[in-house]
């Protein structure tokens, strides 16, 4: 669709005569008829296939024609067409004399024709005017013409309809060739697809307007490249949505069970060595001079009774000093000047000569120790109680007082709440410090797996095209993570193909 525009500029008829040579009375009141038609090698009469237009009387004899386009007038003359411009044309311009006010062809005598010109040729669509002048023996006509496209039509032959728009069916303006030019932030064949925030994850993010990044279920972050871990995951991470992969030292379904109490809580004091011995369980190995479950108690260096053979211990700033009884010497009174003849063995110990009588050794009865059997045995010195148990001397024997959750002679056994198989429907039992926890199989929940729930939403393999299925345990629904090139809640539809017409 376009318009052939003809701008009449000047008509010269100095003698004021008709084509027959007869003069006009009183002068030639001149108007024009224009016929636009398809290209003819020899322009002949016949239908004006591209259109016709007539002017009112524009002047008498010779006159210049005013450009009236700005005032809504008729110059340039408009010959609209509703077809593809063929690039060639034929044009007939007739100048007529109007004796009266009726300009209809049937109201005029045939000899009212002043002049007739006919041209033909090629004409491309464009803004530039082509200037032409046609001269006959008595008249001269100067004019220019061009073809331009109608509003919203584009291209070399005005055949491409394009209307700029900025709504949800497109965000574009039209290029000179009629192709769409997307507004900033939009893309796609019809510029209806927003360009998401730069870096927004191709599969896990999307947008409904430019520079936006909305996350699909299971993803978060400014660019939707961070997975959302399982609801309730405490000390864990994920690489795909709804996972809970435990950090080092943590365990359990929600990574909330402390498997590394030593590192996380540093319970041992005074430089003691900490050893993990189970969930929330540990043992402290104290440095010399300290005692207690957490080695929090400072010992006097004399508390370990370092002086032998009845020597008395004196604490000093830099250690201790043994005061030896008569007949003994050495740092710990360990050397004797006595022999068996001096009856050095106490508490019924029997004496044995050594080194040809120069020395001796006492063999002590049960419950006594020391080089002279002078010490009652403290069965707790070897710290035999595990898992923080407290050692108690009980006459000839010893016993361990265990912390909650432990039993056995040396508190070496973990009290198992799981022994009675409390988890129903094949649930797995986990001992905790203050009780137990059941990990339930798919389809069951509750503290003891006693509640039947819906089965794993991914069990039926609902995702297509090799998509990864994630079960959202909080809602018992599934989420499909589509591979590149597929969309849809089940990844069932390929993207990038042009939509097909329904007919």
């Amino acid at each position: 669709s376009g318009v052939f525009q003809l701008q009449l500029q000047e008509f010269i008829n100095e003698r004021g005569v008709l084509a027959s040579g007869r003069p006009c009375e009183p002068g030639c009141r001149t108007f024009f008829r224009v016929c636009l038609k398809h290209f003819q090698a020899v322009v002949s009469p016949g239908p004006c296939t591209f259109g016709t237009v007539s002017t009112p009387v524009l002047g008498t004899n010779s006159f210049a024609v005013r450009d009236d386009s700005s005032g809504g007038g008729r110059n340039p003359l408009q010959l609209p067409f509703n077809f593809t411009w063929p690039g060639t044309f034929s044009l007939i311009i007739e100048a007529w004399h109007a004796p009266g006010d009726d300009l209809r062809p049937e109201a005029l005598p045939p000899d009212a024709l002043i002049s007739k010109i006919a041209i033909q040729g090629s004409l491309a669509v464009g803004q530039n005017w082509l200037l032409d002048e046609q001269t006959s023996t008595l008249t001269r006509l100067r004019y220019s013409y061009r073809v331009i496209c109608s509003d919203n039509y584009y291209g070399d032959n005005c055949s491409r309809l394009c209307k700029k728009r900025n709504d949800h069916f497109g965000h574009y303006v039209c290029q000179p060739d009629g192709n769409l030019s997307c507004l900033p932030g939009w893309t796609g064949e019809y510029c209806q697809q927003p360009i998401c925030l730069s870096g927004c994850h191709e599969q896990n993010g999307y947008c409904s307007k430019p520079a936006e990044c909305l996350c699909r279920p299971g993803w978060q972050g400014r660019l939707c490249n961070e997975c959302i871990p399982h609801n309730g995951c405490r000390h864990g991470t994920c690489s795909t949505p709804w996972q809970c992969t435990c950090d080092e030292g943590w365990g359990g379904l929600f990574c909330d069970q402390d498997l590394n109490y030593c590192t996380h809580h540093s319970p041992c004091k005074n430089g003691a060595t900490c050893s993990n011995s189970g969930q929330r369980s540990y043992t402290c190995t104290c440095r010399p001079g300290y005692t207690g479950v957490d080695c929090e108690l400072e010992l006097s260096e004399c508390d370990s009774n370092p002086c032998r053979n009845g020597g008395s211990c004196k604490d000093q700033e830099d250690g201790y000093h043994c005061l030896c009884p008569p007949g003994y010497y050495g740092l710990h009174c360990e050397h004797s000047t006595l022999s068996c003849a001096d009856s050095p063995c106490f508490n019924g110990g029997s004496c044995r000569e050594r080194n040809q009588g120069a020395n001796y050794a006492c063999e002590c009865p049960p419950n006594f120790t020391g080089s002279n059997c002078e010490k009652k045995v403290d069965r707790c010195t070897s710290n035999p109680c595990a898992n923080g148990g407290q050692c108690l001397n009980r006459g000839p024997s010893r016993m361990c007082r265990c912390r909650p959750g432990f039993t056995g002679t040396y508190c070496e056994l973990h009290v198992s709440d799981c022994a009675r198989n409390p988890c129903a429907h094949g649930g797995t039992c986990h001992d905790l410090e203050n009780g137990l926890m059941c990990t339930c199989p798919a389809g069951f929940s509750g503290r003891r797996c006693e509640v039947r729930t819906s089965i794993d939403a991914c069990a039926s393999s609902p995702c297509f095209n090799r998509a990864t299925c994630y079960t959202d345990l909080s809602t018992d629904t599934f989420v499909c993570n589509c591979p590149y090139g597929f969309v849809g809640s089940r990844c069932e539809f390929p993207v990038g193909l042009p939509p097909s017409f329904p007919w």
Partner: antibody, heavy 121, light 106 residues
């Protein structure tokens, strides 16, 4: 061949909420090339566009109804829904769902058969 | 709000041409669609993008749109063309329908 089918109650009491669902078969609602619209027609009157939605949930509403309208989409069920709150007798109409095609410059090439909703106590 | 105005009714003899107009401010700068609706039936798209026909729509239906007016023309009208006709355009993000024209084939 794409087909659309409206469903929902045919009678709603004044001041209550009108709820309708459109089920799409023979094609996917999850395409960037389409919007899914609701249009209504009071008895003996002309067509009135209510609003539309795409598969991502972007919605557009008629300004004259915007305060009362909610349109949502469920791609897993290939459905989209209309809720119109605080209804009056003036909301009595045949309600149509339709597919609006980007290629057709927003023209609606497929329509449901329509469902008459009467607002009356 | 944007309005599209149509004549309430148009009468035409069989075999003649019926022209239905649709007027709106600068409508020529928007894409016009036309729908045919017969009693008790859903609307059917007969023209989109001003002048294009969906497949299955007879060639006697044609459309044009310029200035403030879009026109649906039915050449060689047949009795089966008797129906209500609605024009439609988009004003920003809102769909707008004309008031409808009843075409009667005499």
């Amino acid at each position: 061949e794409v087909q659309l089918q409206e469903s929902g109650p045919g009678l709603v009491k004044p001041s209550e909420t009108l709820s309708l669902t459109c089920t799409v078969s023979g094609g996917s609602i999850s395409s960037s090339g389409y919007y899914w619209g609701w249009i209504r027609q009071p008895p003996g009157k002309g067509l009135e566009w209510i609003g539309d939605i795409n598969y991502r949930g972007s919605t557009y509403y008629n300004p004259s109804l915007k305060s009362r309208v909610t349109i949502s989409v469920d791609t897993s069920k290939n459905q989209f829904s209309l809720k119109l709150s605080s209804v009056t007798a003036a909301d009595t109409a045949v309600y149509y769902c339709a597919r609006e095609d980007v290629i057709l410059r927003g023209g609606s090439d497929y329509w449901g058969q329509g469902t008459l909703v009467t607002v009356s106590s | 709000s944007y309005e599209l105005t149509q004549p309430p009714s148009v009468s035409v003899s069989p075999g003649q041409t019926a022209s239905i107009t649709c007027s709106g401010q600068r409508l020529g700068d928007k894409y016009a669609s036309w729908y045919q609706q017969k009693p008790g039936q859903s609307p059917v798209l007969v023209i989109y993008e001003d002048s294009k026909r969906p497949s299955g729509i007879p060639e006697r239906f044609s459309g044009s749109n310029s200035g403030d007016t879009a026109t649906l023309t039915i050449s060689g009208t047949q009795p089966m063309d008797e129906a209500d006709y609605y024009c439609q355009a988009w004003d920003r993000d809102t769909g707008v329908f004309g008031y409808g024209t009843k075409v009667t084939v005499l």
